[in-house]
Amino acid sequence: LPVNTRCKLEVSNFQQPYIVNRTFMLAKEASLADNNTDVRLIGEKLFRGVSAKDQCYLMKQVLNFTLEDVLLPQSDRFQPYMQEVVPFLTKLSNQLSSCHISGDDQNIQKNVRRLKETVKKLGESGEIKAIGELDLLFMSLRNACV
């Protein structure tokens, strides 16, 4: 289904076995440290009311939040994966820098705000949960933006 032309990532970004593997390994390691299995950040509530053509823009917001407010504060943990995955995700973020939507993004901002509030409310364990869902972030970015 169509996306804003600037809200697009080349599929080749997701076809690099080494960094894909490292992203999933980082997620797996963090999820082992996540003791709050009742909450899912990247799930139905995040996308509710967001049309297919706006899903990449939403994922851009989630990616930027994850980089700035989750991965950077936790950058000394989960090595060596973290030091390899952060530059990769930063590259994806840069590629989406000109991704905007023309219509009203109020619902998107509401959904992203809810995710941010959940992470903040959980404190450090919220950050660990977000890292543990990097596999879902990766796949959702791919599905929404390619």
Partner: antibody
Framework: QSVEESGGRLVTPGTPLTLTCTVS????????MIWVRQAPGEGLEWIGI?????STYYASWAKGRFTISRTSTTVDLKITSPTTGDTATYFC?????????????WGPGTLVTVSS | AVVLTQTASPVSAPVGGTVTIKCQAS??????LAWYQQKPGQPPKLLIY???TLASGVPSRFKGSGSGTEFTLTISDLECADAATYYC??????????????FGGGTEVVVK
């Protein structure tokens, strides 16, 4: 949260038929909806989808043969010119995007028989 | 369009036993695979998505695994109520929307 199809009946080839999917417990402004069909004794076949913003997309084989539209609480599937090959149970389902599309819940289906 | 090839029907096992159903995709679909259960006269019911995530209310006896092109649904501690046809379903993104959703041909499970 539930969906239910209606409008299935016996029709003669070439007679247009509209099926209706009525939703309750959720809003069509929050979820896309899909139509899937199943011929007797056969597997599942995706027909098309109507997105939250009203955009419609169809399987390549279904283009021109089906039209999907909606109101605030219903989603219609029009079979423009039925043939005997369109005899099937027609299902509608809610599309929950969770980073990948998943279909849940489904309606019980409505049977369309095309015969002269 | 992606083609999904499932284990041939029927697959049978005794009550308390285990069955394994395979689903092979003709191209890499990452983990964009779901499994549905359909009993005669009923609509499909979502069991698993993201290849391995259990849908709400589905017993842990159902287990999905795999990624890329090879996927498996395993049902352990079989119950009579598990007798049904199981379908895998793929989502393919980035191509034209007219081939986005594909179902496998289905695998019938018989519980003896």
């Amino acid at each position: 949260q539930s969906v239910e199809e209606s409008g299935g009946r016996l029709v003669t080839p070439g007679t247009p038929l509209t099926l209706t999917c009525t939703v309750s417990g959720f809003s069509l402004s929050s979820y896309a909806m899909i139509w899937v069909r199943q011929a007797p004794g056969e597997g599942l076949e995706w027909i098309g989808i109507i997105d939250i913003d009203g955009s419609t997309y169809y399987a390549s084989w279904a283009k021109g043969r089906f039209t999907i539209s909606r109101t605030s609480t219903t989603v219609d599937l029009k079979i423009t010119s039925p043939t005997t090959g369109d005899t099937a149970t027609y299902f509608c389902a809610r599309d929950r995007f969770v980073g990948v599309d998943i279909f849940d819940p489904w309606g019980p289906g409505t049977l369309v028989t095309v015969s002269s | 369009a992606v083609v999904l090839t499932q284990t041939a029907s029927p697959v049978s096992a005794p009550v308390g036993g285990t069955v394994t159903i395979k689903c092979q995709a003709s191209e890499d679909i990452y983990t964009n695979l779901a499994w549905y259960q359909q009993k005669p006269g009923q609509p499909p019911k979502l069991l698993i998505y993201w290849a391995s995530t259990l849908a709400s209310g589905v017993p842990s006896r159902f287990k999905g695994s795999g990624s890329g092109t090879e996927f498996t649904l395993t049902i352990s501690d079989l119950e009579c109520a598990d007798a049904a046809t199981y379908y895998c379903q793929a989502c393919v993104y980035g191509n034209s929307a007219d081939s986005r959703y594909t179902f496998g041909g289905g695998t019938e499970v018989v519980v003896k």
